[in-house]
Interface confidence: medium
């Protein structure tokens, strides 16, 4: 048995930040699990991890330099990514692993979410033309 994952097909990060919600066909309540977000068609970069078990607070971390936070829902994990760069526009995949109780479960690969990062466009200072040349 595999857990099914639903993600938005596309999100636009206008202010270099985005909320990506991963919705699962599985109730995470009272489970030990590891939810992660991966970047790229080959999922080569693990962007953010949300780890939960019964003996400690929810752990949210990135080992790849992303500024991320996570919030747990009954059947979802929402990743909040901040300080994204335009060149981090890519496809992002949600992954979930349930370690306890047995059996170990993970997900069918989802369709992913294209995150389009639109950089902050600062208003340029007004240009004052110099003296015109004769």
């Amino acid at each position: 048995n595999k857990i099914l994952v639903k993600q938005s097909p596309m999100l636009v990060a206008y202010d270099n930040a985005v909320n990506l919600s991963c919705k699962y066909s599985y109730n995470l309540f009272s489970r030990e699990f590891r939810a992660s977000l991966h970047k790229g068609l080959d999922s080569a970069v693990e962007v953010c991890v949300v780890y939960g078990n019964y003996s400690q607070q929810l752990q949210v971390y990135s080992k790849t330099g992303f500024n991320c936070d996570g919030k747990l829902g009954n059947e979802s994990v929402t990743f909040y990514l901040q300080n994204l760069y335009v060149n981090q526009t890519d496809i992002y995949f949600c992954k979930i692993e349930v370690m306890y109780p047995p059996p170990y479960l993970d997900n069918e690969k989802s369709n992913g979410t294209i995150i389009h990062v639109k950089g902050k466009h600062l208003c340029p200072s007004p240009l004052f033309p110099g003296p015109s040349k004769p």
Epitope: F29, S30, R31, E32, G52, N53, Y54, S55, Q56, Q57, L58, L72, G73
Partner: nanobody, 120 residues
Framework: EVQLLESGGGLVQPGGSLRLSCAAS????????MSWARQAPGKGLEWVSW????????FYADSVKGRFTISRDNSKNTLYLQMNSLRAEDTAVYYC?????????????RGQGTLVTVSS
Amino acid sequence: EVQLLESGGGLVQPGGSLRLSCAASGFTFDSANMSWARQAPGKGLEWVSWIESHGGQTFYADSVKGRFTISRDNSKNTLYLQMNSLRAEDTAVYYCAKSPFGPLYGFDYRGQGTLVTVSS
């Protein structure tokens, strides 16, 4: 000393309703995440529901989702579990628990429990 005192259990017919209460003392209730768990005869402890300190987020086990509602009144230091559409398989001792680690199943204190029996 932390105290959690459950009440409201009893005998109810299938399809009926009960409301459990848990009076809390000895800690700062309005900053504590709280849970309900249950233990059926001869079975292990099953987590039923969880609520965060200010009530903004709640979690439910699949077995009770849509039938049970967890709530709290921080001004009264009281936790509640409204149980509707009760079934025979809901028969158990229900425990109120203080859950410091979020909506999973750790707890540092729990009460003595109140027995709920669903039978015709």
